[in-house]
Amino acid sequence: EVEKTACPSGKKAREIDESLIFYKKWELEACVDAALLATQMDRVNAIPFTYEQLDVLKHKLDELYPQGYPESVIQHLGYLFLKMSPEDIRKWNVTSLETLKALLEVNKGHEMSPQVATLIDRFVKGRGQLDKDTLDTLTAFYPGYLCSLSPEELSSVPPSSIWAVRPQDLDTCDPRQLDVLYPKARLAFQNMNGSEYFVKIQSFLGGAPTEDLKALSQQNVSMDLATFMKLRTDAVLPLTVAEVQKLLGPHVEGLKAEERHRPVRDWILRQRQDDLDTLGLGLQGGIPNGYLVLDLSMQEALS
């Protein structure tokens, strides 16, 4: 902690300006009024203070606002934000998207820090849900943001926010996350026509159930193999050969290259070999012709 020392004569700061960079730490402590600092926070960013000097300025604000900074100060923290701890940030009440943007800008180009994560958490909780504008902002700064959320957190995303999501925002999402996001996307895009709908929904299809994949096969979508390989195995298994053929269109030939990988491998095992043969791709491993396929679920229902 900096010692309380009297400000030397003539050094009392009347405003926050570049002359302060020549002040020693103790002089800053003694000569800069916290209330002045708070009202002129927007100037701090333009002045090349050292890290040590920024520590002093932060200390002054902490003394002035022991319960947490007001948003008028937070919005202009600039690089001083990097000095904040998650504990500091938890005291804040950030409601303005402009404030959030300003602070994210400071951290731009870096991994999401614990401070940023805490800030986002406080902001989203304060808003009650992850609305479209917030999601737009967050994914612009952190494309992987959406996939960093738990399925429970994702459940608070309203369908309208899905419009802000770009394909790259979903690159690192796992199936559990896509299971939550897919129904929201389906709802968000439901009024679009076939081809436009597919373009929008494609990135979310890792959460699609069998019935929706079957329905997509009716729309001439020509799904590429990369998308097909990301589908849930349990959703792909019940698809018939004809449905997969219609779903993939001209891309059906790509099944051969993927026949040893999931979900194609498991799907092949579920099909009759003579049905697979009709594709003319040389896919092997289907149920041999003449074998009876028992539907165990039906048997269980009967017993």
Epitope: E211, K214, V241, E243, V244, K246, S297
Partner: antibody, heavy 117, light 107 residues
Framework: EVQLVESGGGLVQPGGSLRLSCAAS????????MSWVRQAPGKGLEWVAT????????YYPDSVKGRFTISRDNSKNTLYLQMNSLRAEDTAVYYC??????????WGQGTLVTVSS | DIQMTQSPSSLSASVGDRVTITCRAS??????LNWYQQKPGKAPKLLIY???RLHSGVPSRFSGSGSGTDFTLTISSLQPEDFATYYC?????????FGQGTKVEIK
């Protein structure tokens, strides 16, 4: 062996309603889309409706949209076609058919619907 | 909607004849073209799907060819049980549509 058996056809007045049923057996009903296709006397085949395996999605041609409703009960392995505001031109044999991707691969024997006053 | 036009509307042939029926789509339907056989008073039966693939149990004398808009069903050697009406159907784009049918009669 796949079997589809339609019922519910009969004589109905113009503007009237009728509900057709189709009992399916010999395969896992809930795995497949199902359809209705009709054939007017001495005429060709006309697709009437299709429903997805779980019943979420339905498809109709403009000629019956808003008048006909396709539905299914997977617990009973049964497909339905509710026909309202019937017209003379709806007179036909109605076939239920299993629909696989783009193929009507198995058909029932049909049930005759006659719309006449 | 895609219109499907079959020709001829009817034809007379003898047992053992080679019979060809054509089906034309009003726009490209890739290979999503199916053929059905219907006998009087009976339900249609699937013969060929995806232009050339025989449905299970269908004799090899039936074959199909074509792509895009023009398709053909060929019966290499007509048998007595083949006298029936044949329909083509496109499965490329909703609404699914059928040709008007080709009746194959005994000469």
């Amino acid at each position: 062996e796949v079997q589809l058996v339609e019922s519910g056809g009969g004589l109905v007045q113009p503007g009237g309603s009728l509900r057709l049923s189709c009992a399916a057996s010999g395969y896992t009903f809930s795995d497949y889309f199902m359809s209705w296709v009709r054939q007017a006397p001495g005429k060709g085949l006309e697709w009437v409706a299709t429903i997805s395996n779980g019943g979420t999605y339905t498809y109709y041609p403009d000629s019956v949209k808003g008048r006909f409703t396709i539905s299914r009960d997977n617990s009973k392995n049964t497909l339905y076609l509710q026909m309202n505001s019937l017209r003379a031109e709806d007179t036909a044999v109605y076939y239920c058919a299993r629909f696989d991707g783009y193929i009507f691969d198995y058909w029932g024997q049909g049930t005759l619907v006659t719309v006449s006053s | 909607d895609i219109q499907m036009t079959q020709s001829p509307s009817s034809l007379s042939a003898s047992v053992g004849d080679r019979v060809t029926i054509t089906c034309r789509a009003s726009q490209d339907i890739s290979n999503y073209l199916n053929w059905y056989q219907q006998k009087p008073g009976k339900a249609p039966k699937l013969l060929i799907y995806y232009t050339s693939r025989l449905h299970s149990g269908v004799p090899s004398r039936f074959s199909g060819s074509g792509s895009g808009t023009d398709f053909t069903l060929t019966i290499s050697s007509l048998q007595p049980e083949d006298f029936a009406t044949y329909y083509c159907q496109q499965g490329n784009t909703l609404p699914w549509t059928f040709g008007q049918g080709t009746k194959v009669e005994i000469k």
